[in-house]
């Protein structure tokens, strides 16, 4: 799986979306979660409604949301007052019996507030600069940079 | 073993430019983040900012925007951090440091030896 | 931005003796505090993360406790070897902040 990066702002909220087949995943269950280590566990942040009918319905687990459209075909986590230790691997996933497929591996990156301690003629964006080389990167700011992606884990 | 090696000391003079780099070793490079973190002559440590090696992605601290960059060569696995613009209170041995987290940010656990650069006339 | 204050700026201890640093934040930092330790000429080393856990290889006379605004690391008996210059670090917020540091000295 390719990974796609999703760049918010510290103390912002951050949302995250996980395309899939809508057929292939009907009457799936989704759930979001982290990536423990390199060769560790994903481990479960939030999933949807325990009655798919009902995938619609945001779910909490803290500050991270959890919805799904499963007719478009589009599940959307939202991650609220976005913080530093928020940085991290996370997977979407389909869930079917006790297994899981992974829709999409997204690295979340938490960036500084742009607007902290500085004034509006001093606008600065994270990373306008920055050339992404093969990463394909959202903001929460809704600009985009190169696309294509990079493959995660690489191989050492 | 996990290191991470760093370029040779420099004197620099106020107004110009400096580049280090931090070669690292013994771990997926691609997978933890770089920090930049610096400390003055018989001073405490100042964090500069970080580099996510995968992404290519940096965040600074606001008191050095505009003056730092930092990029990073993943074939070789090799950090860098220049600061431009140069001043004497920029003299001091600048170091880089791996986070703990896997892609996310706990804690400094691998350091390089530090690199002195001098700014003096 | 957040200020982290040690306490006490130096601390003259025995080697056998209990040391007790303090780190206080200027606001909440949760349990995201680490401490590091420095001797003369060489980079720092991560002790604790997260507060209280022990990084790998750390001895267990090292522990760390707190969250919030408070915090603490306890060397149980001092060795020899632990006379050096102690951190604190934020990474709760940016700018990720370091306190001033505590020098645990020989007395």
């Known amino acids: 799986h390719n990974t796609t990066v999703f760049q918010g702002v510290a103390g912002q909220s951050l949302q995250v979306s996980c395309p899939y087949d809508s057929m292939k995943h009907w009457g799936r269950r989704k759930a979001w979660c982290r990536q423990l280590g390199e060769k560790g566990p994903c481990q479960r942040v939030v999933s949807t409604h325990n009655l798919w009918l009902l995938s619609f319905l945001r779910r909490w687990n803290g500050s991270t949301a959890i919805t799904d459209d499963t007719l478009g075909g589009t599940l959307t986590i939202t991650l609220r007052n976005l913080q530093p230790h928020d940085a991290g691997l996370y997977q979407c996933q389909s869930l079917h019996g006790s297994e899981a497929d992974t829709l999409r591996k997204v690295l979340v990156e938490v960036l500084a507030d742009p607007l902290d301690h500085r004034d509006a003629g001093d606008l600065w964006f994270p990373g306008e600069s920055e050339s992404f080389e093969d990463a394909h990167v959202e903001h929460s700011i809704s600009r985009s940079l190169l696309e294509g992606e990079i493959p995660f884990p690489p191989t050492s | 073993q996990v290191q991470l090696v760093q370029s040779g000391a420099e004197v620099k003079k106020p107004g110009a430019s400096v580049k280090v780099s931090c070669k690292a070793s013994?771990?997926?490079?691609?997978?933890?983040?770089m920090h930049w973190v610096r400390q003055a002559p018989g001073q405490g440590l100042e964090w500069m900012g970080w580099i996510n090696p995968n992404s290519g992605g940096t965040n600074y601290a606001q008191k050095f925007q505009g003056r730092v960059t930092m990029t990073r060569d993943t074939s070789i696995s090799t950090a860098y951090m220049e600061l431009s613009r140069l001043r004497s209170d920029d003299t001091a041995v600048y170091y880089c440091?791996?986070?703990?987290?896997?892609?996310?940010?706990?804690?400094?656990?691998?350091w390089g030896q530090g690199t002195m650069v001098t700014v003096s006339s | 931005e957040i200020v982290l204050t040690q306490s006490p700026a130096t601390l003259s201890l025995s080697p056998g003796e209990r040391a007790t640093l303090s780190c206080r934040a200027s606001?909440?930092?949760?349990?995201?505090l680490a401490w590091y330790q420095q001797k003369p000429g060489q980079a720092p080393r991560l002790l604790i993360y997260d507060a209280s856990n022990r990084a790998t290889g750390i001895p267990a006379r090292f522990s760390g406790s707190g969250s919030g605004t408070d915090f603490t690391l306890t060397i149980s008996s001092l060795e020899p070897e632990d006379f050096a210059v102690y951190y604190c670090q934020q990474v709760s917020n940016y700018p990720f902040t370091f306190g001033g540091g505590t020098k645990v000295e020989i007395k």
């Open positions: 013994g771990y997926t490079f691609t997978g933890y983040y």
């Open positions: 606001q909440s930092v949760s349990s995201y």
């Open positions: 440091a791996r986070d703990l987290g896997y892609s996310s940010l706990l804690a400094l656990d691998i």
